[in-house]
C-alpha cells in the first residue's frame, strides 16, 4: 500500500456540501473549514474521513500498489481496502509490501496452514508439532504439497 500524504483541502468548490460543526466537530466524510465555522465534504474517490473530527483537511485515499487487488474503493468515509494478490502475503512487521508465499515446507515438516493474503504457509515439525518460522528453505530441502493436501 502506498502511504499517501494527507491532502490539504483547497477552498471549497461550489459542489462541495457544507454544514455546521456539532460540538466543534464535523461528521465522517467531512472536515472543518479554516475558520472553524463550516463542515466541508470530502471528495469522493480522492479523500475521506472516518470519524467525527476537526481536521482542516480530509485524508488522501490510498492507491493499491501493483501486486495488490482493490477489495473496496475509497469513499468519503472509508479508505480504499487493498489486499495482496493470490500467492502473496503481507506481514504485520513489514506492511509496505506483499511477499511471495513459500511453495512448501522444509523436510521433516508438514503444512498446516495455507498461504493467505495476510500470512505465509504454516509449517510444523512432524514429530513435535512445533511451528517453523524463518526464511524460505533452500529448494532441495523443500517438500512441496498441493494446496488441497490435508495435513498428516
Amino acid at each position: 500500500i502506498t502511504q499517501q500524504d494527507l491532502a490539504p483541502q483547497q477552498r471549497a468548490a461550489p459542489q462541495q456540501k457544507r454544514s455546521s460543526p456539532s460540538e466543534g466537530l464535523c461528521p465522517p466524510g467531512h472536515h472543518i473549514s479554516e475558520d472553524g465555522r463550516d463542515c466541508i465534504s470530502c471528495k469522493y474517490g480522492q479523500d475521506y474521513s472516518t470519524h467525527w473530527n476537526d481536521l482542516l483537511f480530509c485524508l488522501r485515499c490510498t492507491r493499491c500498489d501493483s501486486g495488490e487487488v482493490e477489495l473496496s474503493p475509497c469513499t468519503t468515509t472509508r479508505n480504499t481496502v487493498c489486499q495482496c494478490e493470490e500467492g502473496t502475503f503481507r506481514e504485520e512487521d513489514s506492511p509496505e509490501m506483499c511477499r511471495k508465499c513459500r511453495t512448501g515446507c522444509p523436510r521433516g515438516m508438514v503444512k498446516v496452514g495455507d498461504c493467505t493474503p495476510w500470512s505465509d504457509i504454516e509449517c510444523v515439525h512432524k514429530e513435535s508439532g512445533t511451528k517453523h518460522s524463518g526464511e524460505a528453505p533452500a529448494v532441495e530441502e523443500t517438500v512441496t504439497s498441493s494446496p488441497g493436501t490435508p495435513a498428516s
Epitope: D35, N53, L56
Partner: antibody, heavy 117, light 110 residues
Framework: QVQLVESGGGLVQPGGSLRLSCSAS????????MIWVRQAPGKGLEYVGF???????YYASWAKGRFTISRDNSKNTLYLQMNSLRAEDTAVYYC???????????WGQGTLVTVSS | DIQMTQSPSTLSASVGDRVTITCRAS??????LSWYQQKPGKAPKRLIY???SLASGVPSRFSGSGSGTEFTLTISSLQPDDAATYYC????????????FGGGTKVEIK
C-alpha cells in the same frame, strides 16, 4: 486594545482546587475557540485543552476529569477550573485565542499556580 | 495524539548566522503548523502560521517551510534579539488529536 489577562493563580495545597480566569478585551470571545496552555518552571509549553465557539471543551488526556474549561460570553471571560491539584501541576498557565488554520494568535501574560504544602 | 519532535534542543550561533530549526510530526498535518518564539518570563509570540505565512509584525528574516511531516523554521541572519526558545505546534485536529507542542529549541548567541 486587543488583549487577554489571566488571574486567579496563587499557592494551593495538594488536593486543592483553583479557578483561573481569562478576561478578554478588544474582541468578543464568543466568536473564537480559546485554548489553555501551561508551562512548568524551566520546561516547555504543554497543551491543557480548548473550548470551541459553541462551548464544547476538549482536553489533553492527562487533564480529563480534573480540569474543566468554560466561558461566560456575557463577561467576555474564559475559565479553567482545576481540581485535585498535584505538585506537578505547578506552572504558569496561559490562555490564548485559537484560530483554526492560523494557530494561537493572541496570548495572555500568564498566571502562576504553585501547588505545595 | 500527534507527537511533535523538534531538533536541535539547543543551538548556539553567532550574530549574522543562518539558523535552521526542524520540527517533525508523527503523522501528516499538511501545512497546518505554527511556530512560536518565547523569551524568559514572557508569553509566547506567534511567528509563522500555515507553515510559511509570516505573522503580522514579525521581521522578514524569519521564514518557515515544509508540509506533511517535516517542517523548518529559518532565521536568515541571526540578531541578538532572536535569543529565545522556539516551539512548533500543529493546528489541524486540535480536538481530534490534541495540540502537543514540540519540545522547544533554545537559541543562544555566541
Amino acid at each position: 486594545q486587543v488583549q487577554l489577562v489571566e488571574s486567579g493563580g496563587g499557592l494551593v495545597q495538594p488536593g486543592g482546587s483553583l479557578r483561573l480566569s481569562c478576561s478578554a478585551s478588544g474582541f468578543s470571545i464568543s466568536r473564537y475557540a480559546m485554548i489553555w496552555v501551561r508551562q512548568a518552571p524551566g520546561k516547555g509549553l504543554e497543551y491543557v485543552g480548548f473550548i470551541t465557539s459553541d462551548s464544547s471543551a476538549y482536553y489533553a488526556s492527562w487533564a480529563k476529569g480534573r480540569f474543566t474549561i468554560s466561558r461566560d460570553n456575557s463577561k467576555n471571560t474564559l475559565y479553567l477550573q482545576m481540581n485535585s491539584l498535584r505538585a506537578e501541576d505547578t506552572a504558569v498557565y496561559y490562555c490564548a485565542r485559537y484560530t483554526y488554520s492560523d494557530g494561537t494568535d493572541l496570548w495572555g501574560q500568564g498566571t502562576l499556580v504553585t501547588v505545595s504544602s | 495524539d500527534i507527537q511533535m519532535t523538534q531538533s536541535p534542543s539547543t543551538l548556539s550561533a553567532s550574530v549574522g548566522d543562518r539558523v535552521t530549526i526542524t520540527c517533525r510530526a508523527s503523522q501528516s498535518i499538511s501545512t497546518y503548523l505554527s511556530w512560536y518564539q518565547q523569551k524568559p518570563g514572557k508569553a509566547p509570540k506567534r511567528l509563522i502560521y500555515k507553515a510559511s505565512s509570516l505573522a503580522s509584525g514579525v521581521p522578514s528574516r524569519f521564514s518557515g517551510s515544509g508540509s506533511g511531516t517535516e517542517f523548518t523554521l529559518t532565521i536568515s541572519s541571526l540578531q541578538p534579539d532572536d535569543a529565545a526558545t522556539y516551539y512548533c505546534q500543529p493546528n489541524s485536529g486540535i480536538a481530534t488529536y490534541g495540540a502537543a507542542f514540540g519540545g522547544g529549541t533554545k537559541v543562544e548567541i555566541k
